[in-house]
Interface confidence: low
């Protein structure tokens, strides 16, 4: 039964749940359909179109699918809390036919001292308290149960874990007389997993821990711990994987150095250094052992923690990430960009690309943006002709045992997708940029000129005349 895996269901009961092992991977795209992939390898697009059409025609049959909402469940263990002591929780939409579980960690920066946490509590209370959380949330992007919006995992059990610990999902300290705030991000994840085991997660085949921004970094910090937790609880059958979106930051030199005054201007290394102490932050054990005491902040940076991780992780990162630029004190205000800044931005893209060199599963478009996976149009961006849902599908397949020990990429199914063009929005599928003052959409050529990129400079490395390049960019090619 090794070589060819079909999706035949045997016996009457829903097939396998956990037994005792965590292996990288058996991701068949739509696990409920009796389909055999082997005959369609050559024409995947047509095949996926058929699956989509079949899914859409079956869609009305499933009453549970008609309600798109994820429902709020506050943790039963109320000692695991948000910053202000209110119970943490999660939003869940079950998909009873599926043994895939997607747990999404929300993002939203962080605070690292009493002063900026107080300020955050005043202005962004939802990120520090569950008191005003809505009863339901709509799943979008990778959390959508609509096959057309989420061709990757529409049929999965969807879990959205709101970020209310302000600690990049790393904290392990409770509120006390001494501590005005609780920072329990790492504990919240563990408790959500524990509670979900009683809601069907115990029967999972794959748990994908995903997250965006601070949630993406949270994935890198927690994915191995979740795998270990499940093994210890007797569910090593569940394959734990990570999907880190826009959480792969660089501890690079800021464009302009500023003192560590607030969350946004403080250099990330200093913010995290202070944060870890304030949050009683925990990092993956194998990474921690690589650094001296007091140097655990290193493990918040993707390129340092990734090589120590055991679970498979797919990294999604814009080469010109807006949060990265913000902490580097680059603020693109619409004024023409000076050459020094242009070179800084281009170098950032180059450095980021370099850190992804040895990350086999990665998707890094050369765009100026932030976060992607829970955007409704997350399917639109392509790198080298491959969309992100498609790349994730290929990742699932590459992890699946049917490809035996072969480490060579699957033909026509790439998982390492990093743009090589050197400036923001040189990829024509990048999300549309808007002028932040007028709100007007800009095409790539307008955007680059708006940013002060000299068309001659941009065109030359491509072996093009500026006029040719402008024509190409204006046509979106």
């Amino acid at each position: 039964s090794e070589g060819r895996k079909t999706w035949r269901r045997r016996g009457q009961q829903p097939p396998p749940p956990p037994r005792t092992e965590a292996a990288p991977a058996a991701g068949q795209p739509v696990e409920s359909f009796p389909l055999d992939f082997t005959a369609v390898e050559g024409n995947m697009d047509s095949f996926m179109a058929q699956v989509k059409s079949l899914a859409q025609s079956l869609y009305p049959c499933s009453a549970q699918q008609l309600n798109e909402d994820l429902r709020l469940h506050l943790l039963l263990n109320t000692s695991v809390t948000c910053n202000d002591g209110s119970p943490a929780g999660y939003y869940l939409k079950e998909s009873r036919g599926s043994r895939r579980w997607l747990l999404f960690l929300e993002g939203g920066w962080y605070c690292f001292n009493r002063e900026n946490c107080d300020s955050r509590y005043d202005t962004m209370r939802r990120l520090m308290s569950s008191r005003d959380w809505p009863r339901t949330r709509t799943g979008t992007g990778i959390l959508s149960s609509q096959p057309e919006e989420n061709p990757y995992w529409w049929n999965a059990n969807m879990v959205f874990i709101p970020y209310c610990s302000s600690d990049v999902w790393s904290g392990a300290s409770s509120k006390s007389e001494k501590n005005e705030y609780a920072f329990m991000g790492a504990l919240i994840i563990q408790e959500v997993v524990r509670e979900l085991l009683g809601r069907g997660l115990s029967g999972a085949k794959v748990l994908l821990l995903a997250g965006s921004s601070a949630g993406g970094t949270g994935v890198l910090l927690n994915v191995d711990r979740v795998a270990e937790q499940l093994e210890k609880l007797g569910y090593p059958a569940i394959q734990v994987r990570g999907l880190a979106d826009s959480g792969w930051f660089l501890d690079n030199k800021q464009y302009r150095h500023t003192d560590c005054v607030d969350t946004i201007t403080c250099a990330p290394t200093e913010a995290i250094r202070r944060g870890i102490r304030y949050w009683n932050g925990v990092v993956p054990e194998r990474c921690r052992r690589q650094f001296q005491e007091g140097e655990e902040w290193n493990c918040f940076f993707g390129y340092k923690v990734y090589p120590t991780l055991r679970c498979p992780v797919f990294v999604v990162q814009w080469l010109f990430d807006e949060a990265q630029l913000t902490v580097d004190n680059v603020h693109l205000t619409g004024q023409p960009v000076q050459e020094g800044l242009r070179l800084y931005i281009q170098n950032l893209g180059r450095e980021l690309r370099h850190t992804l060199k040895d990350v086999p599963a990665s998707f890094a478009p050369a765009c100026l943006s932030h976060e992607i996976i829970i955007r409704s149009h997350w399917t639109d961006v392509q790198v080298k002709g491959t969309s992100l849902p498609r790349a994730l599908h290929c990742w699932d397949r590459s992890l699946h045992d049917s490809h035996k020990a072969s480490k060579t990429p699957l033909k026509g199914c790439p998982v390492h997708l990093v743009d090589s063009c050197p400036w923001p929005h040189c990829n024509p599928s990048c999300p549309t940029v808007r002028d932040q003052f007028t709100g007007q959409e800009m095409n790539v050529a307008q955007f680059l000129m708006h940013m002060g990129f000299d068309m001659q400079t941009v065109a030359q490395p491509q072996g093009l005349e500026p006029s040719e390049l402008l024509g190409m960019l204006s046509n979106g090619s």
Epitope: G11, P14, P16, P17, T20, A22, A237
Partner: antibody
Framework: EVQLVESGGGLVQPGGSLRLSCAAS????????MNWVRQAPGKGLEWVSY????????YYADSVKGRFTISRDNAKNSLYLQMNSLRDEDTAVYYC????????????WGAGTTVTVSS | DIVMTQSPLSLPVTPGEPASISCRAS??????????MHWYLQKPGQSPQLLIY???NLESGVPDRFSGSGSGTDFTLKISRVEAEDVGVYYC?????????FGAGTKLELK
């Protein structure tokens, strides 16, 4: 063809040590949890030990805890069982088995290697 | 530990006739809609082979005269028509918790 081949069994005195090996082929060894299961002469099957695919987790039956150590080398597609302080009651055929992703059952078994503990 | 009790311990059957083996767990081995009970056959002089996993799922390559049923603590393996090649010892095994344990075995022989 998916195959597990055990080796390293033999006659050993009580208190002695032995190291069993299991060579895997025909599947992605590094993706599966592996187990040792034994069968004493004329008796039933007894689960001995488990190791996860990544080696993060190991489990042992109470009867061997502290004496046996399971390990694996994914680069060599090999599973091992180091048996120390052997006792008469450890005499058995030792099977290496692959644990399926889906539910804690053993879907591939080796032919077994015989360990005899006797003075 | 979860104790698995199999019955009968010996089962003489006429070829072509049905056979049924029972396995009882000392506590429930079912959870979240799944039953962590599996069945193996060990033919004379061979290593065990998987027949049924998760109570009712037929392993690839196993003849469909074999079937499994049950949930909670009581499980049954049925052979609709016994053939000569079915001779051997049948074991049930649970994977609900550690340690994983097997039943004592049921020896199926031909009359």
């Amino acid at each position: 063809e998916v195959q597990l081949v055990e080796s390293g069994g033999g006659l050993v005195q009580p208190g002695g040590s032995l190291r069993l090996s299991c060579a895997a082929s025909g599947f992605t060894f590094s993706s599966y949890g592996m187990n040792w299961v034994r069968q004493a002469p004329g008796k039933g099957l007894e689960w001995v030990s488990y190791i996860s695919s990544s080696t993060v987790t190991t489990y042992y039956a109470d009867s061997v805890k502290g004496r046996f150590t399971i390990s694996r080398d994914n680069a060599k597609n090999s599973l091992y069982l180091q048996m120390n302080s052997l006792r008469d009651e450890d005499t058995a055929v030792y099977y290496c088995s692959r644990q399926n992703w889906d539910g804690g059952y053993f879907d591939v078994w080796g032919a077994g290697t015989t360990v005899t503990v006797s003075s | 530990d979860i104790v698995m009790t199999q019955s009968p311990l010996s089962l003489p059957v006429t070829p072509g006739e049905p056979a049924s083996i029972s396995c009882r767990a000392s506590k429930s081995v079912s959870s979240s809609g799944y039953s962590y009970m599996h069945w193996y056959l060990q033919k004379p002089g061979q290593s065990p082979q998987l027949l049924i996993y998760l109570a009712s799922n037929l392993e690839s390559g196993v003849p469909d005269r074999f079937s499994g049923s049950g949930s909670g603590t009581d499980f049954t393996l049925k052979i609709s028509r016994v053939e000569a090649e079915d001779v051997g010892v049948y074991y049930c095994q649970h994977s609900r918790a550690l340690p994983l344990t097997f039943g004592a075995g049921t020896k199926l022989e031909l009359k």
